[in-house]
């Protein structure tokens, strides 16, 4: 029997110390913030070029328009992340050509194609949540009792709205039993 530590919940993706949830349902920007908060996460705030490249790849691979935690709702033209930090100079390069264009009060930012676009915040889109990965230290007793006998996590998109996150959230730690022949 081999015990493995999983730093992220089921259906979340680990990257450089953080866990990311790519939603399978669509919500407007404000509801996306709520969805992330309800699972102890945040609508994604991008901190490095590596993280941006990783997330852009996820979004473009799935060919989905996806909300990030960036808007200019507080002050037109001043883009700010949901953690209160401003959009820093080096991240402005990620806007698609001609964006942000604020056509028709487009105040929220999305992953679109190979870059970012501003769009109307009330539109329903996919979203990405981010939270710190759990520590895998045994001293902290973070291993939980074995999970129910479900060989695989539920299929992507099987839950509606927030349910898909809640299901993924239920078991953050899991003892995997490998049978060696």
């Amino acid at each position: 029997t081999e015990r493995l530590c999983h730093p992220c919940p089921w259906e979340w993706t680990f990257f450089q110390g953080n866990c990311y949830f790519m939603s399978n349902s669509q919500r407007n920007w404000h509801d996306s913030i709520t969805a992330c908060k309800e699972v102890g996460a945040q609508l994604v705030v991008i901190k490095s070029a590596e993280e941006q490249n990783f997330l852009q790849l996820q979004s473009s691979r799935s060919n989905r328009f996806t909300w990030m935690g960036l808007s200019d709702l507080n002050q037109e033209g001043t883009w700010q992340w949901v953690d209160g930090s401003p959009l820093l100079p080096s991240f402005k390069q990620y806007w698609n050509r001609g964006e942000p264009n604020n056509v028709g009060e487009e105040d929220c930012a999305e992953f679109s194609g190979n870059g970012w676009n501003d769009d109307k915040c009330n539109l329903a889109k996919f979203w990405i949540c981010k939270k710190s990965a759990a520590s895998c230290s045994r001293d902290e007793e973070q291993f939980l009792s074995p999970a129910p006998a479900t060989p695989n996590p539920p299929p992507a998109g099987s839950g509606g709205g927030l349910n898909d996150i809640f299901e993924a959230q239920k078991i953050e730690w899991h003892e995997h039993h490998h049978h060696h022949h």
């Epitope: 490095s48 993280e51 930090s85 401003p86 820093l88 100079p89 080096s90 390069q93 710190s132």
Partner: antibody
Framework: QVTLRESGPALVKPTQTLTLTCTFS??????????VSWIRQPPGKALEWLAL???????YYSTSLKTRLTISKDTSKNQVVLTMTNMDPVDTATYYC???????????WGQGTMVTVSS | QSVLTQPPSVSGAPGQRVTISCTGS?????????VHWYQQLPGTAPKLLIY???NRPSGVPDRFSGSKSGTSASLAITGLQAEDEADYYC???????????FGGGTKLTVLG
């Protein structure tokens, strides 16, 4: 070759306003990705970031000094100006301007200008 | 009190290896923001030594290297030379302060 040079008064009186000019060459502040920042260093102490202006004319200020600082640029003259109001003796420092290219590293610095605040 | 914590001083003999630590928090280094290192020789302006955690600008000897893990970063100098005697500063961005932040600086003394 990228060069930056700071200029301004060596001595200012308490409560006065300090105006510093950074004149640069070797790059343009109208080029995407370019920014210029002001950083100071009191004698024998650590570096402290003050303000930054980017090619887009977006301005960023130190939270603790925000109410006292104004940064602006004159792209045609290749200059960035910092004004700091209500000067106090604790503001005595060497003031540097520095270029910040992508990834938020200050990759080129001026030689610095020493400003003493005293009556 | 600086947001990024560095040891005030380190020392080593010529040829030795020294490391300088830079400890931050979840709002700066731990958040994923890049770390940069500067060398300030006595009486001169700082000079970029390491950018984006571990990259050297052209002209910086490969005796200097940087790394980052979790909420901290470190600068290593191997084959210590007399001309390495200087102050070294780490720098990152802090989302709580909405600003760029520096460490308190570390004075490197080359013995002998």
């Amino acid at each position: 070759q990228v060069t930056l040079r700071e200029s301004g008064p060596a001595l200012v009186k308490p409560t006065q306003t300090l105006t510093l000019t950074c004149t640069f060459s070797g790059f343009s502040l109208s080029t995407s990705g370019m920014s210029v920042s002001w950083i100071r260093q009191p004698p024998g102490k650590a570096l402290e970031w003050l303000a930054l202006i980017d090619w887009d004319d977006d301005k960023y200020y130190s939270t603790s000094l925000k109410t006292r600082l104004t940064i602006s640029k004159d792209t045609s003259k290749n200059q960035v100006v910092l004004t700091m109001t209500n000067m106090d003796p604790v503001d005595t420092a060497t003031y540097y301007c520095a270029r910040m290219a992508l990834r938020h590293a200050f990759d080129a610095w001026g030689q610095g200008t020493m400003v003493t605040v005293s009556s | 009190q600086s947001v990024l914590t560095q040891p005030p001083s380190v020392s080593g003999a010529p040829g030795q290896r020294v490391t300088i630590s830079c400890t931050g928090s979840s709002s700066n280094i731990g958040a994923g923001y890049d770390v940069h290192w500067y060398q300030q020789l006595p009486g001169t302006a700082p000079k970029l030594l390491i950018y984006v955690n571990s990259n050297r600008p052209s002209g910086v000897p490969d005796r200097f290297s940087g790394s980052k893990s979790g909420t901290s970063a470190s600068l290593a100098i191997t084959g210590l030379q007399a001309e390495d005697e200087a102050d070294y500063y780490c720098q990152s961005y802090d989302s709580s302060l909405s600003g760029w932040v520096f460490g308190g600086g570390t004075k490197l003394t080359v013995l002998g």
